[in-house]
C-alpha cells in the first residue's frame, strides 16, 4: 500500500521537516529558515510561533516542531498551547475588568489564578465549622454539633438489656 | 548569484566509501540550509540528507545510518561522507542551498 501512495503522490515521500515543493517539480526541499513541518507529506512549512511581549520561549523552534511558550513571572498561561497569558493575582484574590480585588467576605481563592469560590457550607454535611475561612482558605469541617454536646462520646454506649413484659419507661 | 561546484564522485565497489564535497561561493553557509540530493536514470530527484536552518542533520531512510552529511562555514563547504554504498547509490549527486543547485557529481556503484 505504501508503495502504491508513493508511486501515485510523491508528496508522501517527504518526511517532517520538508515540504513538497511544486516549483520543483514535488521534489522534497527542506523547510525555509524559521519554519517547521512537524509530520510528512507536507506541501507547505509552518511559520514558527514567535514567543513576544509577555510570551517567552519554553521550547525553542525547529525545522521539526513548532516553538512552545509560556508567560514572563506574573502572568500564567491560559488556552490549548499557552494562545494566552493572564495576570497573577494574590492569593484571597481574582482577576476583574479593573484588575486584582479582594475577594468578598464569604468566599476564597487559595491560588494566583481563577475566581473566588464560596466557602463549604458545614452544615450541609451536618458538621460545624472547627476552622473559619479567610480569603485564602476555605472553613475547615468537623464534627457535628451532637457530637460535640456535653457529655457526648465518640463510642456509643451498648443499648442496656431488656426483660421482657416491661415496655421501656 | 551563489554558486555551487561539487567534486568527490567516482566508481567505488559495493561496501565502499566515497565522500561528497560542496563549495560555495558567497556567505551563503552561516545561514541557509545545506541538502544533498540524487538523481538516478529515469527517476525524480530525491533529498538524500540535509541539514535544516536550525543546524541539525536529517536523512532519508535509505541514507540513515550510512550517509553523514556536515558542514564547515569556514570554508563555504558541505560534505556528504558515504559508507557502505550499494548498487542502488548509483546516481548523480547534487549539492543544494536555497534556490541554488550544483552541476551534480556521478557516483556509480558496481563490481
Known amino acids: 500500500f505504501e508503495r502504491t501512495r508513493s508511486l501515485q503522490d510523491p508528496c508522501s515521500n517527504c518526511p517532517a521537516g520538508t515540504f513538497c515543493d511544486n516549483n520543483r517539480n514535488q521534489i522534497c526541499s527542506p523547510c525555509p529558515p524559521n519554519s517547521f513541518s512537524s509530520a510528512g507529506g507536507q506541501r507547505t512549512c509552518d511559520i514558527c510561533r514567535q514567543c513576544k511581549g509577555v510570551f517567552r520561549t519554553r521550547k525553542e523552534c525547529s525545522s521539526t516542531s513548532n516553538a512552545e511558550c509560556d508567560c514572563t513571572p506574573g502572568f500564567h498561561c491560559l488556552g490549548a498551547g499557552c494562545s494566552m497569558c493572564e495576570q497573577d493575582c494574590k492569593q484571597g484574590q481574582e482577576l476583574t475588568k479593573k484588575g486584582c480585588k479582594d475577594c468578598c467576605f464569604g468566599t476564597f481563592n487559595d491560588q494566583k489564578r481563577g475566581i473566588c469560590r464560596p466557602w463549604t457550607n458545614c452544615s450541609l454535611d451536618g458538621k460545624s465549622v472547627l476552622v473559619n475561612g479567610t480569603k485564602e482558605r476555605d472553613v475547615v469541617c468537623g464534627p457535628s454539633p451532637a457530637d460535640l454536646s456535653p457529655g457526648a462520646s465518640s463510642v456509643t454506649p451498648p443499648a442496656p438489656a431488656r426483660e421482657p413484659g416491661h415496655s421501656p419507661q | 548569484a551563489v554558486q555551487l561546484v561539487e567534486s568527490g564522485g567516482g566508481l567505488v565497489q559495493p561496501g565502499g566509501s566515497l565522500r561528497l564535497s560542496c563549495a560555495a561561493s558567497?556567505?551563503?553557509?552561516?545561514?541557509?540550509?545545506s541538502a544533498w540530493y540524487r538523481q538516478a536514470p529515469g527517476k525524480q530527484r530525491e533529498l538524500v540528507a540535509w541539514?535544516?536552518?536550525?543546524?541539525?542533520?536529517h536523512y532519508a531512510d535509505s541514507a540513515k545510518g550510512r550517509f553523514t552529511i556536515s558542514r564547515d562555514n569556514t570554508k563555504k563547504t558541505a560534505y556528504l561522507q558515504m559508507n557502505s554504498l550499494k548498487l542502488e547509490d548509483t546516481a548523480v549527486y547534487y549539492c543544494?542551498?536555497?534556490?541554488?543547485w550544483g552541476q551534480g557529481t556521478q557516483v556509480t556503484v558496481s563490481s
Open positions: 543544494n542551498s536555497g534556490d541554488s
Open positions: 558567497g556567505n551563503i553557509f552561516s545561514i541557509r540550509v
Open positions: 541539514i535544516a536552518w536550525d543546524n541539525i542533520a
